[in-house]
């Protein structure tokens, strides 16, 4: 697996991250991995539509190290990570990187290899046990069976690590057998099967909503005593935590 060239880290204050771009906005504890099929089963123009879908989804997520962390991987016979879960960059910068994922147009896109990469590289160590872990597998092709030898092992390995796998089959060549096998492994592994990339936009909100519903809301922030706000009621001293209650999703 190869990684994208490292650019200087942009530090920013997470609490003053960029404002929501849409009414629908997912503010949950979530580690989300986008896996993009880099095979020639998608034309270069179709791959651009696929990337636009990923960017559109990212716009609807509260991306930060505290809320929704994202990773973006293009897969062919190997895997190329463009964004890692721990990358501390502004959401707009992450979206820009996602929009610049290169079209591989390879003969093979190995779902087994990218799930292995997800299992052993991305989720090798669970550093945010309180967050949901979801992999969105965008697949438009079929790998040779010999490459699929350990497919079920990797799907089961992800299940053991509580990683939900959501396959999105795109077009006539998507491997329906693998999609059904993923679904069979866990009830949360819901599949979306689309006839072409043109249907991605129609399904986007349903997919984001489904992902978001699987993730927990953040617990109310606990503050040290000196940060507490004293409220006086009739004949009663009370303590409440600062800050408004955060809604998980604004529709």
């Amino acid at each position: 697996p190869t990684d994208a060239p490292v650019s200087p880290t942009t530090l920013y204050v997470e609490d003053i991250s960029e404002p929501p771009l849409h009414d629908f906005y997912c503010s949950r504890l979530l580690d989300l991995v986008f896996l993009l099929d880099g095979s020639s089963r998608l034309s270069e123009a179709e791959f651009e539509v696929l990337k636009a879908f990923v960017v559109d989804m990212m716009e609807r997520l509260r991306i930060s190290q505290k809320w929704v962390r994202v990773a973006v991987v293009e897969y062919h016979d190997g895997s190329h990570a463009y964004i890692g879960l721990k990358d501390r960059k502004r959401p707009s910068e992450l979206r820009r990187i996602a929009s610049q994922v290169k079209y591989a147009g390879s003969q093979v896109a190995s779902t087994s290899e990218v799930l292995k990469y997800t299992l052993f590289q991305i989720f090798s160590k669970i550093d945010r046990p309180e967050a949901s872990r979801i992999t969105l597998l965008l697949m438009a092709s079929q790998e040779p069976q010999r490459m699929s030898r350990n497919f079920v092992r990797y799907v089961q390995g992800l299940k053991k690590k509580k990683v939900i796998v959501i396959p999105v089959g795109i077009g006539p060549h998507a491997n329906l057998k693998q999609i059904r096998l993923i679904e069979k492994q866990a009830p949360e592994n819901k599949a979306f099967v689309l006839s072409s990339v043109d249907e991605l936009e129609q399904q986007r909100d349903e997919i984001v909503s489904y992902l978001c519903d699987l993730a927990p809301e953040a617990p109310p922030p606990t503050l040290p005593p000196d940060m507490a706000q004293v409220t006086v009621g009739p004949g009663l001293l009370g303590v409440s935590t600062l800050g408004p209650k955060r809604n998980s999703m604004v529709l």
Partner: antibody, heavy 122, light 107 residues
Framework: QVQLQESGPGLVKPSETLSLTCTVS????????VDWIRQPPGKGLEWIGM???????DYNSALKSRVTISVDTSKNQFSLKLSSVTAADTAVYYC????????????????WGQGTLVTVSS | DIQMTQSPSSLSASVGDRVTITCSAS??????LNWYQQKPGKAPKLLIY???SLHSGVPSRFSGSGSGTDFTLTISSLQPEDFATYYC?????????FGQGTKVEIK
């Protein structure tokens, strides 16, 4: 019922190519793989390679440069070709069915042909 | 390649005996191990797959156990038709590899 039968010449000259055929019945060629295994006289089993239901292949690295496994679905036949043979290739050659299906990761050779003895000698 | 080592290479036993054959892998193979039985002049037959799952039609006197690198095939009460050579085979990593075999002979 599931059946596999190997056929081919029993005698091959050194440096020539050994060619065997495995004719199968009772199962779908796209749902199963077929493996080739050999057993030199009085010795143990050696895996040669396999062909998957979609025609993709895997070979034993020790034999890879000399082996070709292919399928003719219209005849329900699998073939093994081993080039540049020497006396060390003398063995009983078996073909066996492999549930080579990523929905089932138990890759066990559940049905075997009866085997065919190939002697390499001039 | 993963090396598979069986022990003993041969053993003598009587009908009714409990027989144990061990198989050791050169590296961790999880539970990805099969056992085959071969009689002289015949093709091997699958007995047990995935360490302990009995193949259809195989008598319940055969059982398998183990995980990682060490595995066992047990015949609880040896029958006359069980005199044969037994092979273990790993399928954790290609190429599939077999043990050298254990010959079970009549005492």
């Amino acid at each position: 019922q599931v059946q596999l039968q190997e056929s081919g010449p029993g005698l091959v000259k050194p440096s020539e190519t050994l060619s065997l055929t495995c004719t199968v019945s009772g199962f779908s060629l796209t749902d199963y793989g077929v493996d080739w295994i050999r057993q030199p006289p009085g010795k143990g089993l050696e895996w040669i390679g396999m062909i998957w239901g979609d025609g993709s292949t895997d070979y034993n690295s020790a034999l890879k440069s000399r082996v070709t496994i292919s399928v003719d679905t219209s005849k329900n036949q699998f073939s093994l070709k081993l080039s540049s043979v020497t006396a060390a290739d003398t063995a009983v050659y078996y073909c066996a069915r492999d549930p080579a299906d990523y929905g089932n990761y138990d890759y066990a050779l559940d049905y075997w042909g009866q085997g065919t003895l190939v002697t390499v000698s001039s | 390649d993963i090396q598979m080592t069986q022990s003993p290479s041969s053993l003598s036993a009587s009908v009714g005996d409990r027989v144990t054959i061990t198989c050791s892998a050169s590296q961790d193979i999880n539970k990805y191990l099969n056992w085959y039985q071969q009689k002289p002049g015949k093709a091997p037959k699958l007995l047990i797959y995935y360490t302990s799952s009995l193949h259809s039609g195989v008598p319940s006197r055969f059982s398998g156990s183990g995980s990682g690198t060490d595995f066992t095939l047990t015949i609880s009460s040896l029958q006359p038709e069980d005199f044969a050579t037994y092979y273990c085979q790993q399928y954790e990593k290609l190429p599939w590899t077999f043990g050298q075999g254990t010959k079970v002979e009549i005492k």
